[in-house]
């Protein structure tokens, strides 16, 4: 599941890794963009072992899912929600 | 040190059972998915199976699945491998490994083997 | 299940050369790719993880590149003690994977 927010008062990341993530390890990922108090987009992966990674953004493994993403809601309707889940 | 020692290995004839084990010191087994694989004699590596560390996730090698079933006691810091309806084609070296969820996310170690030989 | 083309099945390198070997996967693994080597009569040793990443103590000779369904694995110097069999493995998902192995001899 992939889930977007909106609303950051400040950066959570401190320390980001470009390492690839098998999904069957992945519970959810988190995508902040940049604003509300962080100059800077983050992308907080929570694994299924209950820890917490930050990816950096430019990382190829997460680019590439990003753009697959992508591909995927451009051919669906968008949810206007505030909160985006994305299975 | 990390110390992965596989045994339970030995000679069976075909139709028969086995069970490997696999005893893991100097790492935190309870936290790790871990992995069975196996080499037959002059071949290449074949993923077997893979447990995650509740048990609760349990993937196989789709033409193994039916005979062999993956386990673990983590109070016991052991991983199984309980293999049924052998046949001479699984004959193989089987090695546990560890599944590294954390950092790498590969098989970072690696027991020495136990060899399995099928045979009438 | 994803298949791992590896290529050349063997090669012979002088020391000091540098040696290359490909990895095709049938579908796309991301950068969810590493490569093992394996010395005769021993368990196999992780070398690269994530297509690039160099695992802790691995020379700096050896390196991994790729994505998508291409990958490469390098040498750039061969030294004796690599005399061994190559491995690439694709572990995006399951069931894992491995290439049929690169045997590698000194001339």
């Known amino acids: 599941v992939l889930e977007v927010y909106y609303t950051h008062l400040r950066c959570r990341c401190v320390q980001e890794s470009s390492v690839f993530i098998p999904r069957r390890f992945i519970d959810r990922i988190q995508i902040s963009p940049r604003g509300n108090g962080c100059p800077r987009k983050e992308i907080i992966v929570w694994k299924k072992n209950k820890s917490v990674v930050c990816v950096d953004p430019q990382a190829e493994w997460i680019q590439r899912i990003m753009e697959m993403l992508r591909k995927k809601s451009s051919s669906t309707p968008p949810v206007p929600v505030f909160k985006r889940k994305i299975p | 040190e990390v110390q992965l020692v596989e045994s339970g290995g030995g000679l069976v004839q075909p139709g028969g059972s086995l069970r490997l084990s696999c005893a893991a010191s100097g790492i935190d087994f309870s936290r790790y998915w871990m992995s069975w694989v196996r080499q037959a004699p002059g071949k290449g590596l074949e993923w077997v199976a893979e447990i995650n560390p509740e048990s609760s996730t349990i993937n196989y090698a789709p033409s193994l699945k039916d005979r062999f079933t993956i386990s673990r006691d983590n109070a016991k810091n052991s991983l199984y491998l309980q293999m049924n309806s052998l046949r001479a084609e699984d004959t193989a070296v089987y090695y546990c490994?560890?599944?590294?969820?954390?950092?790498?996310?590969?098989?970072?170690?690696w027991g020495q083997g136990t060899t399995v030989t099928v045979s009438s | 299940d994803i298949q791992m083309t590896q290529s050349p099945s063997s090669l012979s390198a002088s020391v000091g050369d540098r040696v290359t070997i490909t990895c095709k996967a049938s579908?796309?693994?991301?950068?969810?790719v590493a490569w093992y080597q394996q010395k005769p009569g021993k368990a196999p040793k992780l070398l690269i993880y994530?297509?690039?990443y160099r695992y802790t103590g691995v020379p700096s000779r050896f390196s991994g590149s790729g994505s998508g369904t291409d990958f490469t694995f390098t040498i750039s110097s061969v030294q004796p003690e690599d005399i061994a069999t190559y491995y690439c493995q694709q572990y995006y998902s399951t069931p894992l994977t491995f290439g049929g192995g690169t045997k590698l001899e000194i001339k």
């Open positions: 994530s297509a690039s």
């Open positions: 579908q796309d693994v991301n950068t969810g």
């Open positions: 490994a560890r599944q590294d969820d954390y950092e790498y996310y590969a098989m970072d170690y």
